[in-house]
């Protein structure tokens, strides 16, 4: 039994880091493998993660952490019974994938303005809380070409757009994702999408 693709890990910079790797053949990850991880910190103890299958030869493990600070570094040991298959290390702050925003809501009752709001996925005491920026994706269910991205570079989790920038009388969907420039993170997953029917009063044309 050998590791074909070494484990790579990403952290949500809160409580979970996810590590994925591939073996050289079909593997029952949960029964055959264990990933041991330990914070490089005086008196800390090793923890064991039981991996799950992620495709035939792929394994994934969700490492639980109390919290994360920038100096944290973990040792990782991948074991198959008594055999050490791989040894490595992981610094969560250097491999951050933020949590996805939640509670995306479209408010359509504000005088021909669409107000989209969502929730910051981090608590106020987490470093990323004040460092997230967002991308909002809006698309038409009727017209695949009607697809747009709005970059929200301010901290407030909201976006205002004129309803008239979208077509009237048809349904739209929106979703939002986050990233943090300070840690050069990857983008989060998209939030669940929300749907609304776009309608607004056409301006009265005077000739």
């Amino acid at each position: 039994m050998k590791v074909l693709q070494e484990p790579t890990c990403v952290s949500d910079y809160m409580s979970i880091s996810t590590c994925e790797w591939k073996m050289n053949g079909p593997t029952n990850c949960s029964t055959e493998l264990r990933l041991l991880y330990q914070l490089v910190f005086l008196l800390s103890e090793a923890h064991t993660c039981i991996p799950e299958n992620n495709g035939g030869a792929g394994c994934v493990c969700h490492l639980l952490m109390d919290d994360v600070v920038s100096a944290d570094n973990y040792t990782l040991d991948l074991w198959a019974g008594q055999q050490l298959l791989w040894k490595g290390s992981f610094k969560p702050s250097e491999h951050v994938k933020p949590r996805a925003p939640g509670n995306l809501t479209v408010h359509t009752n504000v005088s021909d303005t669409l107000l989209l709001t969502w929730s910051n996925p981090y608590p106020p005491d987490n470093y990323l809380y004040n460092h997230l920026t967002y991308a909002v994706n809006i698309w038409s269910e009727n017209d695949p070409a009607d697809f747009r991205i709005y970059n929200v570079t301010y901290l407030e989790p909201s976006l205002r757009i004129a309803a008239s920038t979208l077509k009237s009388g048809i349904s739209y969907r929106a979703r939002v994702r986050a990233w943090a420039q300070c840690y050069n993170t990857t983008w989060s997953e998209w939030s669940p999408s929300t749907k609304w029917h776009n309608s607004y009063r056409e301006p009265f044309e005077q000739h």
Epitope: L39, S44, D66, V69
Partner: nanobody, 115 residues
Framework: QVQLVESGGGLVQPGGSLRLSCAAS?????MAWFRQAPGKEREAVAT????????YLADSVKGRFTISRDNSKNTLYLQMNSLKAEDTAVYYC???????????WGQGTLVTVSS
């Protein structure tokens, strides 16, 4: 120049309690309490990470000692309960920029547990 000033040591009867304090001139990733009993090597007793959420204790003191830090005052504490004669030692505060916790040391405070 980093300064660590310990206080709170003294003579206490077995089963008693003491609270040690350590004032630090700065914030550090790792803060720790070590102790050295007469004729023995210095050993780590308790450690705490920046932010103060994650704490670690040596097996010999689990359930009896707690470590905490007040980040606003840059002060480290060690609450010692149910003290035993074998806890007698000089207790040192130490801080570090990494998980080894040994970059800077205090001068030590003596704790004597005796009836």
């Amino acid at each position: 120049q980093v300064q660590l000033v310990e206080s709170g040591g003294g003579l206490v009867q077995p089963g008693g309690s003491l609270r040690l304090s350590c004032a630090a001139s700065g914030d550090f990733y790792c803060m720790a309490w070590f102790r050295q009993a007469p004729g023995k090597e210095r050993e780590a007793v308790a450690t705490i990470r920046s932010g103060g959420r994650s704490t670690y204790l040596a097996d010999s003191v689990k359930g009896r000692f707690t470590i905490s830090r007040d980040n606003s005052k840059n002060t480290l504490y060690l609450q010692m309960n149910s003290l035993k004669a074998e806890d007698t030692a000089v207790y040192y505060c130490a801080v570090g920029v990494d998980g080894n916790c040994r970059n800077y040391w205090g001068q030590g405070t003596l704790v004597t547990v005796s009836s």
